[in-house]
């Protein structure tokens, strides 16, 4: 029997039942290779509470349709007196990526999963040349899912200070150049997930091979390698490779675009601080609303409830389905059953079944999917209790006053599936919006203006037009809602601009769209504020103008008009200046745009060196000066000593030329002991200094990701911006 979904065959997939602390391993084409589950297990269940393993699906006992895969076992299970076999059921839906299997529910006998994946699509429109699994579970069974970052067309431009080259990447899959309007990517070879553009030429520097890996808590790594044999002539004999490290931001660092942290010998190291690297809580509720602090999620489906005897009706060929959410169906022939979903046979309306009961309800927000599950319906002939799964989709323009209507999509073993497009399922994800703008290779980053939490305070705009008695206070945050503190305490929760006067507070707009570059300035538009009459809502425009060296000045109110429906602010700030690379001398560097100066000379050791010890080597490093440690060469800025035989390598000659770009200070030592390759490439060292105000001097850390380049990172308070 041919594999039903060949794209999914190369990997063993994972799904989790968080409530019961159970990890499932799934291999849909072969076996999972877990001894405790036996040689032919396709679905292996690991109960972490009891530390036991059970096979809940056998690869030999597989049956498949276009949208359903069932794995039976020979193990008996007892459900309400009927004798069944344990089985797993995976319902497939068309998705835009390979996706992830999602645990839905489990009964005594059946383990239900749902999987939105390109493999289940009738057409190949979303299928990739190369794609790898893009999620992982950590030790606490929390899911880290990068699927939302996958681009279906185009690519991400990696932030790099080199004006002559551009590195484009996709996440977990190759770059689709055909559907991308940007001409730069057209030349990228098929299959590449990392494409280096130099002039009019494009080179494949990495293709996806292995799935996403969790290397540390909240640090995910994706590695791309070049499959082709031929070497690239600018790589000094090395094979190109790309390592992307996704980092969950701490409170101090918000999401960013991918940043190149090292690129010696075509070994490209990229760091991407993104909320998608954080674990995504599975939010569940037994009511019709749920909220999750971490994801900034708030969902309330109660407006969808029907009352006064009416229900939603969904046509299912042989059957009609009467549904209500957040309440029972109140139609005559269903109400004795306490049904939320009621199934009525068209040809014989006396045949009525509850396809899920109101009091057996679970609302789940998981990885961007909003699902309402009703359990415990009437039994099918097999003894299983009917169940309904409603998948909600956000649709801001849904009919029926935004409520929309449920649509029956199919039935799998007495489980009934519906989709429901409604505006009440719209959830704004923070990470969807960037707090910056791009104009070709020019980058603008407004994140320095964001106020996150106390003790920080909102920006207050200057308004010279009013007398003290009629004074309005205008509180503004950038790419974030205003902090509810001080005079802004009463501001509406999701307002990004808020006006406060003696009559109360007003929402002047929410952060709904990313900043844009317009006419040399950055424009930030906040919309969907409070009502201002005639069915209109208040809108605010902020024009940010580059003012080098100034991150302190406040925004100024320029105009307010259209009967209080429109406000315009102007803000002269260094955050609106283009990011540029600057070089310095004598262990100092000055960022003229932002007005920051950095001096790392306190890190220079007059005698000795900083030591980094690994199992095989000792590394000695100095900052802006030579290491004075035997057996290192006297002029080396960094040196490597083998523990086994004290063999020594110079990792680069010392210098004091710091470079600064977008919050990263770097020191490059070149011209070390040559490698033993055809080109005899000299060894080099790159030290990246990162700001941490508590670190003091700090110490160097070796990044063990790549053996052919020597990359160190160094947290230090001396890398934190100081006003000159």
């Amino acid at each position: 029997q041919a594999a039903p979904f060949p794209e999914l065959c190369s990997y063993t997939w994972e799904a989790v039942d968080t409530k019961n602390n159970v990890l499932y391993k799934i291999n849909i084409c072969g076996s999972v290779d877990i001894v405790q589950c036996g040689p032919s297990s396709a679905v292996c269940m690991h109960d972490l509470k009891t530390r036991t393993y059970h096979s809940v699906g056998d690869s030999v006992l597989r049956s498949a349709t276009r949208s359903l895969l069932e794995f039976n076992t020979t193990v008996s299970c007892d459900q309400q007196g009927t004798n069944h076999r344990v089985q797993s059921s995976i319902a497939f839906l068309c998705g835009k990526t390979l996706g992830t299997p999602e645990f839905v529910t489990a009964t005594e006998c059946v383990h239900y999963f749902e999987w939105r994946t390109t493999a289940a699509c009738k057409k190949d429109i979303f299928k990739a040349n190369k794609e790898v699994p893009c999620y992982v579970f950590d030790e606490e069974l929390r899911k880290h899912d990068l699927n939302p970052l996958i681009k279906l067309s185009g690519a991400y431009l990696v932030d790099d200070s080199d004006p002559d080259t551009s590195l484009f990447i996709n996440v977990c899959r190759d770059i689709d150049t055909l559907r991308d309007p940007g001409s730069q990517l057209r030349a990228c070879p098929p299959g590449t997930a990392a494409c280096l553009v130099r002039g009019h030429q494009a080179f494949d520097v990495g293709q996806p091979r292995d799935g996403l890996k969790l290397v540390r808590k909240d640090r995910l790594v994706l590695s791309y390698v070049r499959e082709e044999a031929g070497k690239l002539d600018f790589c000094d004999g090395h094979s190109p490779a790309v390592t992307i490290t996704f980092v969950c931001p701490s409170e101090r660092r918000e999401g960013t675009i991918p940043k190149l942290t090292a690129k010696s010998n075509c070994r490209y190291e990229i760091e991407w601080i993104t909320e998608y690297a954080c674990h995504r809580d599975y939010l569940e509720s037994k009511t019709c609303s749920l909220s999750g602090e971490q994801q900034d999620v708030s969902i309330d489906l109660t407006p969808l409830a029907q009352s006064g005897g009416s229900s939603y009706i969904s046509d299912g060929k042989e059957y009609l389905f009467y549904l209500n959410v957040c309440g029972e169906t109140e139609i005559q022939f269903c109400n004795k059953k306490q049904a939320a979903v009621c199934q009525v046979k068209k040809s014989d309306t006396s045949q009525v079944k509850a396809a899920g009961r109101y009091h057996n309800q679970t609302l789940r927000y998981s990885d961007g999917d909003l699902t309402l599950i009703y359990f415990g319906g009437d039994e099918c002939s097999s003894g299983f209790q009917r169940m309904s799964v409603i998948n909600f989709e956000c649709n801001k323009t849904a009919g029926n006053d935004g409520k929309g209507t449920p649509v029956f999509t199919g039935e799998v073993d007495c489980t009934y599936f519906f989709t429901w497009d409604t505006e009440y399922a719209c959830v704004k994800e923070k990470e969807d919006l960037l707090c910056g703008a791009t104009d070709g290779k020019k980058r603008y980053d407004l994140s320095a203006l964001v106020r996150h939490a106390e003790p920080e305070q909102n920006w207050e705009a200057v308004d010279g037009s009013q007398t003290e008695t009629e004074k309005k206070h205008f509180f503004i945050n950038i790419c974030h809602r205003v902090l509810q503190e001080g005079k802004a305490r009463g501001c509406p929760e999701d307002a990004a601009v808020c006006a406060v006067d003696k009559n109360g507070s007003k929402n002047l707009g929410k952060f709904i769209s990313s900043p844009m570059k317009e006419k040399g300035n950055i424009q930030l538009s906040y919309s969907d504020g409070d009502d201002c009459g005639h069915g209109k809502k208040i809108k605010t425009n902020i024009t940010l103008v580059c003012k080098p060296g100034d991150l302190e000045s406040a925004p100024v109110l320029r105009t307010s008009g259209e009967g209080g429906c429109f406000y315009e602010f102007e803000w002269h700030t260094a955050a609106a200046c283009v990011l540029s690379k600057t070089e310095g001398e004598n262990c100092t560097v000055f960022d003229s745009q932002a007005g920051f100066s950095f001096d790392l000379s306190p890190l220079t050791k007059k005698n000795g060196a900083y030591k980094v010890e690994t199992k095989k080597y000792d590394f000695y490093i100095n900052v802006c000066g030579p290491v004075s440690v035997s057996p290192c060469q006297p002029d080396s800025g960094a040196c490597q000593v083998a523990k086994s035989d004290e063999k020594t390598w110079n990792l680069g000659l010392s210098n004091a030329k710091l470079s600064y770009y977008d919050g990263m200070i770097q020191l490059n030592y070149r011209g070390g002991t040559p490698y033993n390759n055809e080109r005899h490439t000299p060894r080099a060292t790159l030290i990246t200094f990162l700001c941490d105000r508590d670190a003091g001097v700090g110490f160097p850390e070796y990044q063990e990701e790549d053996n052919s380049t020597y990359n160190f990172r160094w947290y230090t308070s001396y890398a934190c911006p100081e006003e000159p």
Epitope: R216, K217, D218, R219, V247, C248, S250, K611, V612, E613, T614, K615, D692, A695, G698, F699, E701, Y702, E704, Y715
Partner: nanobody, 123 residues
Framework: EVQLVESGGGLVPAGGSLRLSCAAS????????MGWFRQAPGKERKFVAT????????YYADSVKGRFTISRDNAKNTVYLLMNSLKPEDTAVYYC????????????????WGQGTQVTVSS
């Protein structure tokens, strides 16, 4: 897999001393650099000290330099933190952590963590 168990915390007057211990299970203890971190209520986890796998390299946070000493005994699979001249601002839960191969300042780079031991310094 490495499991870490801290002990030695408690209540101590300002100026007093404590010695924290962190016992590791597993035969590969000497493959790991070890670190001590602390977390006060409502605050982020902060670096305190780190020691390389052999014990040959140690680094400390500025706030504890000269007062705290980190050491390890690979034969006993244990790492220690000797805390002298304790101050009320040293009050926190102290965590022991293990990182494969080499040391780091960043708590997110550590592979294994203990459950923590409470240290309270009264004024």
């Amino acid at each position: 897999e490495v499991q870490l168990v801290e002990s030695g915390g408690g209540l101590v007057p300002a100026g007093g001393s404590l010695r924290l211990s962190c016992a590791a299970s597993g035969r590969t203890f000497s493959n790991y650099a070890m670190g001590w971190f602390r977390q006060a209520p409502g605050k982020e986890r902060k670096f305190v000290a780190t020691i390389s796998w052999s014990g040959g390299v140690t680094y400390y946070a500025d706030s504890v330099k000269g007062r705290f000493t980190i050491s390890r005994d690979n034969a006993k699979n244990t790492v220690y933190l000797l805390m002298n001249s304790l101050k009320p601002e040293d009050t926190a839960v102290y965590y022991c952590a293990a990182k494969r191969d080499s040391s780091s300042y960043d708590h997110r780079r550590y592979d294994y963590w203990g459950q923590g031991t409470q240290v309270t310094v009264s004024s």
